[in-house]
Amino acid sequence: MAVTACQGLGFVVSLIGIAGIIAATCMDQWSTQDLYNNPVTAVFNYQGLWRSCVRESSGFTECRGYFTLLGLPAMLQAVRALMIVGIVLGAIGLLVSIFALKCIRIGSMEDSAKANMTLTSGIMFIVSGLCAIAGVSVFANMLVTNFWMSTANMYTGMGGMVQTVQTRYTFGAALFVGWVAGGLTLIGGVMMCIACRGLAPEETNYKAVSYHASGHSVAYKPGGFKASTGFGSNTKNKKIYDGGARTEDEVQSYPSKHDYV
């Protein structure tokens, strides 16, 4: 039960995280105009990975895509790549983890196969989360560098005659969404990996033997409590008859309403 909960929670957390990574990647507010010097600006600038926008006091917002590929800074390209890799890995991870979920049965899939799939998806989520965190952090570092550079020469112009206030940019909402989303995906991935340990069959797993006890219908299973916990799996046990005790596998074969979260 604990394994199913851990796996299910890991899946949900990762799902939220990947949705957040997608949202952050699509958002326009990766960097926003710093309003420290002019808090009542009539023109507000903000930029995303794919386009830059200008919101006017009048209520009009104009966005223009970056229609060049070669003309863009290498760092921006790197951030784009990291975020896309994160989304792709996360999406594949989600697909794999759906089939790996303990509460979903697909044919006669072995628990060992589910364990492997859970581990694979977990690793994918971890890498996806790291990609998102790395991408956002690289962009944030780029912003900090540019911020202090533009602060150093706040006013530029022709021999100091023309006063041109340089627009400085600070952290936008997308950065925080990206950090949180990356963190959630990472946590979800770790949870999937932890759940995988519980799903994996023991190395020294004995063959279960059924004994007929006289006057009683009892199935005896070597391995003690492992048969009734989620940590040892034995798919080879056959039931004696309906009135007798069932193995763990058989209990799962007839799901009750409590088996679904």
Epitope: V40, A42, V54, E56, S57, S58, G59, E62, Q163, T164
Partner: antibody, heavy 118, light 113 residues
Framework: EVQLLESGGGLVQPGGSLRLSCAAS????????MSWVRQAPGKGLEWVST????????YYPDSVKGRFTISRDNSKNTLYLQMNSLRAEDTAVYYC???????????WGQGTLVTVSS | DIVMTQSPDSLAVSLGERATINCKSS????????????LTWYQQKPGQPPKLLIY???TRESGVPDRFSGSGSGTDFTLTISSLQAEDVAVYYC?????????FGGGTKLEIK
């Protein structure tokens, strides 16, 4: 055709109050920022206030800050300017204007005259 | 605050001739985000409210005759009437639409010579 009609102007004593209204029609009022601009007799234009489309932001020059309050009622398609502690130098024709692209005041009302005199 | 300075204060031009009005701002009105200059030109005829002519320094408002054109960038701007018509007699104002407080130039009175 966009229409803006100011009202509420008149003669008021120094230190008195007045509330101007601007009724808007033929456009989606709630989507646009609106401004008040004044023009003293024989003088140039002076911006008085701007309010954002969602009522969240209001802007004033130092000359009227703390005395004038801009507001809007999107359900009534009406812009207001509450003027308190009026001075002789506030005497002017007050225009309301709809802001468009480039923060330009693309449509203006005919104006209402406010005279502050004892 | 951004100070807008217009020149000349008044201008007399013959019908059909070119009229040029200048406007200078104390700070740049160029927005780096979209590379547009937030300068607006208005025309005010006697007894009438102002009328928008040009925004973004050079974009003509719809319905404005093409003899009106705006140019300039940063701090120096020009309104040009290529061929003066009798109906162009008015006072022309430039306005900073880049940052609050919005400020207007003192106006240029255009007359027929």
């Amino acid at each position: 055709e966009v229409q803006l009609l100011e009202s509420g102007g008149g003669l008021v004593q120094p230190g008195g109050s007045l509330r101007l209204s601007c009724a808007a029609s033929e456009f989606t009022f709630s989507n646009y920022a609106m401004s008040w601009v004044r023009q003293a007799p024989g003088k140039g234009l002076e911006w008085v206030s701007t309010i954002s489309s969602g009522r969240s932001s209001t802007y004033y020059p130092d000359s009227v800050k703390g005395r004038f309050t801009i507001s809007r009622d999107n359900s009534k398609n009406t812009l207001y300017l509450q003027m308190n502690s009026l001075r002789a130098e506030d005497t002017a024709v007050y225009y309301c204007a709809k802001l468009g692209r480039g923060n330009a005041m693309e449509y203006w009302g005919q104006g209402t005259l406010v005279t502050v005199s004892s | 605050d951004i100070v807008m300075t217009q020149s000349p204060d008044s201008l007399a031009v013959s019908l059909g001739e070119r009229a040029t009005i200048n406007c200078k701002s104390s700070q740049s009105l160029l927005n780096s985000g979209n590379q547009k200059n937030y300068l607006t030109w208005y025309q005010q005829k006697p007894g009438q409210p102002p009328k928008l002519l040009i925004y973004w320094a050079s974009t003509r408002e719809s319905g404005v005759p093409d003899r009106f054109s705006g140019s300039g960038s940063g701090t120096d701007f020009t309104l040009t009437i290529s061929s003066l018509q009798a109906e162009d007699v008015a006072v022309y104002y430039c306005q900073n639409a880049y940052s609050y407080p919005f400020t207007f130039g003192g106006g240029t009175k255009l007359e027929i010579k």
